[in-house]
């Protein structure tokens, strides 16, 4: 089993639409069970997206390049919640996700109608299959929710920004 | 054949130390976060830590955390866990033991033979 | 963490029965829970994961079912070689916990 998520990190406006994109490939002949699933940061990151992340933090990532602060830490210390889930046809949402615009397309791709502010973290396309127990199950990709302020280009030059037309 | 073969154990006094290695062969060492689980004298499976797959991730359970430390050798496929100050809940039967997928959220598919850890007086 | 119980420290059945083990956890695990078989003097065994998907090599009198919070571990005839440990596991969030086991005695 391969699991691809193209995009590591993406930036979306706040009550726009966004589709977080999922690639997978398996020997197995079953079909797959895709999941998506969120789960928010170990600490916040709009700080440091603002430039005003610790020291601590910053020394700590700087002497181990394998390790972020805001993405590495145990779920048990984070939130950790199923967005969607897809079986054949049928697309469940998570409980903390029903009565939102949210859906799975194309296989794999999460669609989210409306971007709310509790919508920043990271984001996992899990997928399961019968008789595929190797490889690489799940990918994540990395969504930053912004308001309109006019400095987004100086904000987060790292990301790449996409703004739906309303 | 995926194969895990630790050692290490014994028997060791409250507040001395012990080293644990964990061979491994047939995968690719290097792409698998590997997990350390103890199962205790009641048969209760508890994990006891588990490292990334390049070695720069540790996670550790409070019961366990400043006390032990687990890391790896990816030139030797090997992977260890250092305890210290051991107290007689530590005694257990130590497993290494890794997942099926080299990265994602999936069960243990492969466990070692164990090594026993006593802690007495 | 998430606490995975079992509620059934041994059950005893006969060859030739069907033996059903439940796990309960404490929060929803969706469909992420394991299976495993321990015989005596062995280490565990996989034999079911997410739920309700058989390891490769298990036996299909072996199978599982449930979401959510609550699991159900099937054997549909139990053999003699059946006598074991069975225990669950969450593999939804880390850290991964196992309940406290359920041992199959054979009468």
């Known amino acids: 089993l391969q699991v691809t998520v193209p995009d590591k990190k993406k930036v979306a406006m706040l009550f726009q639409p966004t589709v977080l994109r999922c690639h997978f490939s398996t020997s197995s002949h079953q079909p797959a069970v895709v999941q998506w699933k969120f789960k928010s940061y170990c600490q916040d990151r709009m700080g440091e997206s603002l430039g005003m992340s610790s020291t601590r933090a910053q020394s700590l990532s700087k002497r181990n390049l394998e390790w972020d602060p805001y993405l590495d830490c145990l779920d048990s210390r984070r939130t950790v919640r199923v967005v969607a889930s897809k079986q054949g046809s049928t697309v469940t949402l998570g409980d903390f996700y029903r009565g939102r615009e949210i859906t799975i397309v194309h296989d794999a791709d999460l669609q989210i109608g409306k971007l709310m502010w509790g919508d920043s973290g990271l984001y996992y396309c899990i997928i399961t299959t019968p008789d595929d127990l190797e490889g690489k199950n799940e990918d994540s990709v990395e969504l930053l929710v912004l308001g309109r302020t006019g400095l987004l280009a100086d904000l987060l030059p790292s990301f790449a920004v996409e703004i739906m037309p309303e | 054949e995926v194969k895990m073969v630790e050692s290490g154990g014994g028997l060791v006094q409250p507040g001395g130390s012990l080293k644990l290695s964990c061979a491994t062969s047939?995968?690719?060492?290097?792409?698998?976060?590997m997990y350390w689980v103890r199962q205790t004298p009641e048969k209760r499976l508890e994990w006891v830590a588990y490292?990334?797959?390049?070695?720069?991730?540790?996670y550790y359970p409070d019961t366990v955390k400043g006390r032990f430390t687990i890391s790896r050798d990816n030139a030797k496929n090997t992977l260890y866990l250092q305890m210290s100050r051991l107290k007689s809940e530590d005694t257990a039967m130590y497993y290494c033991?890794?997942?099926?997928?080299?990265?994602?959220?999936?069960?243990?598919?492969?466990w070692g033979q164990g090594t026993l850890v006593t802690v007495s007086a | 963490d998430i606490v995975m119980t079992q509620s059934h420290k041994f059950m005893s059945t006969s060859v030739g029965d069907r033996v059903s083990i439940t796990c309960k956890a404490s929060q929803d695990v969706s469909t992420a829970v394991a299976w495993y078989q321990q015989k005596p003097g062995q280490s565990p065994k996989l034999l079911i994961y997410s739920a309700s998907y058989r390891y490769t090599g298990v036996p299909d009198r072996f199978t599982g079912s449930g979401s959510g919070t609550d699991f159900t571990f099937t054997i549909s005839s139990v053999q003699a070689e059946d006598l074991a440990v069975y225990y669950c596991?969450?593999?939804?969030?880390?850290?991964?916990?196992f309940g406290g086991g359920t041992k199959l005695e054979i009468k």
């Open positions: 490292i990334s797959n390049g070695g720069g991730s540790t």
């Open positions: 033991a890794r997942q099926g997928y080299y990265y994602g959220s999936s069960p243990f598919a492969y």
């Open positions: 047939g995968f690719t060492f290097s792409d698998y976060y």
């Open positions: 596991q969450q593999h939804y969030s880390t850290p991964y916990t």
